[in-house]
């Protein structure tokens, strides 16, 4: 199809080379056809007609995402030719970073309902570039946290360096939706609450003598509970000794549930004592079986081929530990009488 | 023609639980929508309970009286259901459902264009 | 949670009359405010969102105004047909996680 009607809009994606970041475009479609696939209206209040155009269809998947190489060969769908970019309704997300993103895509709806639809498409320019200014070494994160109950603040990685004062007006998008009262470079949040998590997008516009463009930047932030204060709890074993017949394979699990705590480093290890001896047992991965916003329940096994009578003289000690402190559980094995 | 049905209304002990169920027709819950429940004691003013956002990603707001003892949830791309517990006699009030439009922003600048008949719910022993 | 407070709790005024119903928010919503009109039995009907666009179908004789804390709506060329209970409602949840009523206006014409 000729793309030379599709409107035009230029951005710019400065990624740090420090972190992992993301990155997204919507596919903004000219009125009133973006309203009837992607609910991307951008009416303001005084323009919003008598018959909403977002009360059309409710299939938010109905767009065609194409990448146009800059050899001038024919347009490629991006689900074909790019495993890093995904599309997902109206937003295209990529999930690295890199200059190789840079180029022209291009969205259109997959259904033309009239001759007016042909022409409705929109090219975005989409320029890559690592991020040079060291004089901002204190950038906001893309990852950013809130601490449920308590106030807390969404800053634009971009624009963080800037002060208040300085920072021309930002457009904020939670989950792909217009947050239109959030202006500054940093929405603050009175009390954080679960639906504050999700995916944030600021942007604003950059202009020289010749053009203008929309820098953008995305912030994954999630709601945590405060660190914990307390060390694990063993959750299994509980009895200290356990009954087993010789000769026989025998699996003991660790279970060890972990506060929640933003810099998580857990321990949980199986170490074996026997007389004045003890060493460390090399045992399967640690896995984790249960994870809430509060706390983690993570276990580790120890597996014997088969029972000795050796083994009913040792202790077998399951050892976790957090930042706050240590906690083990130790388990004697007692042969199966009759 | 779009609808907003609720069901599971009735007459429940205090202490009881009650879960109502709101059912969309002529149209699908999308993200233009925050799907949400509101009540009304006999004689008294409209109530808001909580709202769920209807794309399926789980934000939910919720007044802070109802926390703990009211949960809503999207249980299809059709229906949103009110599960209520330890349910007392203030509890008693028809319970409705309305749809929150968000258009393309967040929150329901649009307001709640529609709304269901209404189910009454009676604690009593 | 937000608080919405609305006076008067009723108004009695005649045919032809003004009613004017104010609503104020315990912080600031900006204009994103509705209005609704409920008659005995019915669930109520949206008249106007963000503070001041009247919903389809609604009659210009119901007018919104205001932003940030204060919101006023006035009905005029009052009819027996407009008899009915008015409430304000906080359509910006994002800061308070609350879309609160306000307690309501009973308007009665005589």
């Known amino acids: 199809f000729n793309i030379s009607g599709c409107s035009t809009k230029k951005l710019l994606w400065t990624y740090s080379t420090r972190s992992e970041e993301e990155f997204v475009l919507f596919c903004d479609l000219p009125e009133p056809q973006k309203s009837h696939f992607c609910h991307r209206n951008r009416l303001s209040p005084k323009q919003v007609p008598e018959h909403l155009p977002f009360m059309g269809s409710n299939d938010l998947s109905d767009v065609q995402w194409y990448q146009q190489p800059s050899n001038g060969d024919p347009l490629e769908d991006i689900r074909k030719s790019y495993p890093h970019i995904i599309q997902d309704k109206c937003t295209l997300h990529f999930l690295t970073p890199g200059v190789n993103n840079s180029g022209s895509y291009i969205c259109r709806p997959k259904m033309i309902k009239s001759p007016y639809d042909v022409a409705c498409c929109v090219k975005m320019i989409l320029e890559v570039k690592p991020q040079t200014n060291a004089s901002c070494e204190y950038s906001a994160s893309h990852k950013q946290d809130l601490l449920l109950g308590s106030t807390g603040s969404i800053s634009c990685p971009s624009l963080s360096c800037q002060s208040d004062a300085q920072s021309p007006a930002v457009t904020w998008y939670k989950n792909g939706k217009l947050l239109s009262v959030e202006r500054s470079n940093r929405i603050v949040v009175d009390e954080v609450y679960d639906y504050h998590q999700g995916t944030y997008v600021c942007d604003y516009t950059q202009s020289d003598t010749v053009s203008s463009w929309t820098v953008r930047a995305v912030v994954q932030v999630r709601t945590i509970v405060g660190d914990t204060k307390l060390k694990p709890d063993i959750l299994d074993p509980v009895e200290d000794t356990l009954e087993v017949e010789l000769g026989k394979p025998l699996t003991i699990s660790c279970k060890a549930r972990f506060g929640f705590e933003r810099v998580f480093n857990p321990v949980i290890k199986w170490y074996i004592k026997d007389s004045d001896l003890e060493w460390e047992v090399s045992v399967p991965e640690a896995k984790s079986i249960k994870s809430t916003l509060k706390d983690e329940i993570i276990e580790r096994n120890i597996i014997l081929e088969k029972v000795t009578q050796r083994d009913l003289r040792r202790k077998f000690v399951c050892f976790v530990q957090n930042s706050i402190g240590n906690t083990t559980q130790s388990v004697q094995l007692k042969e199966k009488r009759g | 023609q779009e609808q907003l049905v609720e069901s599971g209304g009735g007459l429940v002990k205090p202490e009881g639980s009650l879960t109502l169920t709101c059912t969309a027709s002529?149209?699908?819950?999308?993200?233009?929508?925050?799907i949400c429940w509101v009540r009304q004691a006999p004689g008294k003013g409209l109530e808001w309970i909580a709202c769920?956002?209807?794309?399926?990603?789980?934000?939910i707001y919720c007044a802070t009286w109802a926390k703990g003892r009211f949960t809503i949830s999207k249980t299809s791309s059709t229906t949103v259901t009110l599960q209520m517990t330890s349910l007392t006699a203030a509890d008693t009030a028809t319970y409705f459902c309305s749809r929150g439009n968000a258009g393309s922003y967040w929150d329901i600048y649009y307001g709640m264009d529609l709304w269901g008949p209404g189910t009454l719910v009676t604690v009593s022993s | 949670d937000i608080v919405m407070t609305q006076t008067p709790a009723s108004v009695s005024e005649p045919v032809g009359g003004t009613v004017t119903i104010k609503c104020q928010a315990s912080?600031?919503?900006?204009?994103?405010l509705s209005w609704y009109q409920q008659k005995p039995g019915q669930p109520p009907k949206l008249l106007i969102y963000?503070?001041?666009i009247l919903a389809s179908g609604v009659p210009s004789q119901f007018k919104g105004s205001g932003s940030g804390t204060d919101f006023t709506l006035t009905i005029s060329d009052l009819e027996c047909a407009d008899a009915a209970t008015y409430y304000c409602?906080?359509?910006?949840?994002?800061?308070?996680?609350?879309?609160?009523f306000g307690g309501g206006t009973e308007v009665v014409v005589k």
């Open positions: 769920i956002y209807a794309d399926g990603s789980g934000s």
């Open positions: 963000q503070a001041s």
């Open positions: 002529g149209f699908s819950f999308s993200s233009s929508y925050w």
């Open positions: 912080q600031s919503i900006y204009s994103y």
């Open positions: 409602q906080s359509n910006y949840g994002f800061s308070s996680g609350s879309y609160a």
